[in-house]
């Protein structure tokens, strides 16, 4: 006999990275017929919602009107059908951005390279932070973590056309409080690759430095969010 229900999906709209003082909605999608949803923040009960009528609703929203550093952290949700509770959702890392200062991002040897060339990003911020984050924009975005007193290096290694895209970096004051984003840097990778094994669909990065986020930068991408797990996997876990 089933003791728990399947875990719900949790995500943030419009994004898990929320500028301070801006609004964000945490969405939790379970099953039709769920009579109660609970949102937990850093392991403690944060909010409860009881959808009406439960048989016609499979998703609830928890609205945060004014994002700040106290609201940033790890969220999860559970739901109940009758007396049976679900497994907890994956953890959603909600990050507050636009804190304090703006880093500068540069790329060597330059923003336009040939496939196979080694590329390194540099994120610099002169204020008190020792951790930096490099993000590539897009639905399947990758976040790389780097360390340094005022600057962090992000070596991508030999690049392929899959590395093309727009990059930004942040200084991180703690796990969930990030600086303003840098100005974007667009990396262009040209050149036909003879050895197609060098061109994966997505860049692969060392497991110890990369966490994968499935991001949605558009609010209306998909109504059926069960198709997508928009959970931000905790980069620092």
């Amino acid at each position: 006999q089933q003791q728990t229900l399947p875990k719900p999906f949790i995500w943030a709209e419009p994004h898990f990275m929320v500028p301070k003082e801006k609004q964000v909605t945490i969405c939790c999608q379970g099953n039709y017929g769920a009579v109660e949803y609970q949102l937990h923040f850093e392991g403690s009960l944060f909010a409860v919602d009881r959808p009406k009528p439960p048989e016609r609703i499979n998703k609830v929203q928890f609205y945060i009107p004014d994002m700040n550093s106290r609201m940033a952290g790890q969220y999860s949700c559970i739901y109940r059908v009758g007396e049976l509770w679900s497994e907890p959702s994956n953890l959603l890392d909600l990050v507050v951005t636009e804190m304090y200062d703006t880093p500068t991002l540069s790329v060597h040897p330059g923003p336009e390279v040939i496939s196979g060339e080694k590329v390194t990003f540099y994120c610099r911020l002169d204020t008190a932070t020792s951790m930096f984050l490099l993000l590539k924009e897009g639905r399947s975005s990758h976040v790389q973590r780097g360390y340094g007193k005022v600057q962090a290096e992000f070596p991508l290694g030999p690049v392929t056309t899959a590395h093309r895209g727009t990059y930004r970096c942040f200084g991180s004051y703690n796990n969930h409080a990030w600086s303003f984003p840098s100005e974007p840097v667009k990396l262009l990778v040209t050149g036909d690759i003879e050895n197609t094994s060098l061109a994966p669909e997505d860049p692969t990065f060392p497991a110890d430095t990369w966490g994968t986020y499935l991001l949605t930068t558009e609010t209306g991408l998909q109504k059926d969010h069960a198709l997508w797990d928009h959970t931000a996997q905790n980069l620092l876990r």
Partner: antibody, heavy 118, light 107 residues
Framework: EVQLQQSGPELVKPGTSVKISCKTS????????MHWVKQSHGKSLEWFGG????????SYNQKFKGKATLTVDKSSSTAYMELRSLTSEDSAVYYC???????????WGQGTTLTVSS | DIVMTQSPATLSVTPGDRVSLSCRAS??????LHWFQQKSHESPRLLIK???QSISGIPSRFSGSGSGSDFTLSINSVEPEDVGVYYC?????????FGPGTKLELK
């Protein structure tokens, strides 16, 4: 010591082709892209194109579209530029130059003088 | 294509002079600007990378500044061996482009 040794001067007839070589030593050939730069007599420098020995990926200056083909031989750590349909306009000194991934063209060959004349 | 222009075309100097060579890009290239020196019958040599960063083995009298589209190479006390042509290079976008050069000569 990093060295880029280019092939000797060439005197060729219009309409023919020529293949210039750039033999490298002193570093890992596949880690740096190799670029070719043209310098006509008394003129500035013009980037012809570049190749990544690691992947075989190339990028060409569209101004010289179809004029050159860049290749490498990894076994001998040598880069090549083949120029075709030569005219007197192609008479120049051609340099190979290594593009460092933390700067620009940090090492250059000594240049190969190409003269196209009937 | 990004067009690089340099001024002056020729600069006549006396040893010990402090000189400034100008380079302008047709659009912003941030700090992706490199300077080269080419002496007569020699290959070019990298002097300054990323607008202002020094290169190992290059005398400290050479320095660079600027960002965006306006850049300057300075030689704070010219030596006779500095005679040659100085080129700036766009390292931002393909095609990589060079300026027409500034010829430095002795008076």
């Amino acid at each position: 010591e990093v060295q880029l040794q280019q092939s000797g001067p060439e005197l060729v007839k219009p309409g023919t082709s020529v293949k210039i070589s750039c033999k490298t030593s002193g570093y890992t050939f596949t880690e740096y892209s190799m670029h070719w730069v043209k310098q006509s007599h008394g003129k500035s420098l013009e980037w012809f194109g570049g190749i990544s020995p690691n992947s075989g990926g190339t990028s060409y200056n569209q101004k010289f579209k179809g004029k050159a083909t860049l290749t490498v031989d990894k076994s001998s750590s040598t880069a090549y530029m083949e120029l075709r349909s030569l005219t007197s306009e192609d008479s120049a000194v051609y340099y190979c130059a290594r593009r460092d991934f933390h700067s620009s063209f940090d090492y250059w060959g000594q240049g190969t003088t190409l003269t196209v004349s009937s | 294509d990004i067009v690089m222009t340099q001024s002056p075309a020729t600069l006549s100097v006396t040893p010990g002079d402090r000189v400034s060579l100008s380079c302008r890009a047709s659009q912003s290239i941030s700090d992706y600007l490199h300077w080269f020196q080419q002496k007569s019958h020699e290959s070019p040599r990298l002097l300054i990378k990323y607008a202002s960063q020094s290169i190992s083995g290059i005398p400290s009298r050479f320095s660079g500044s600027g960002s965006g589209s306006d850049f300057t190479l300075s030689i704070n006390s010219v030596e006779p061996e500095d005679v040659g042509v100085y080129y700036c290079q766009n390292g931002h976008s393909f095609p990589l482009t060079f300026g027409p050069g500034t010829k430095l000569e002795l008076k």
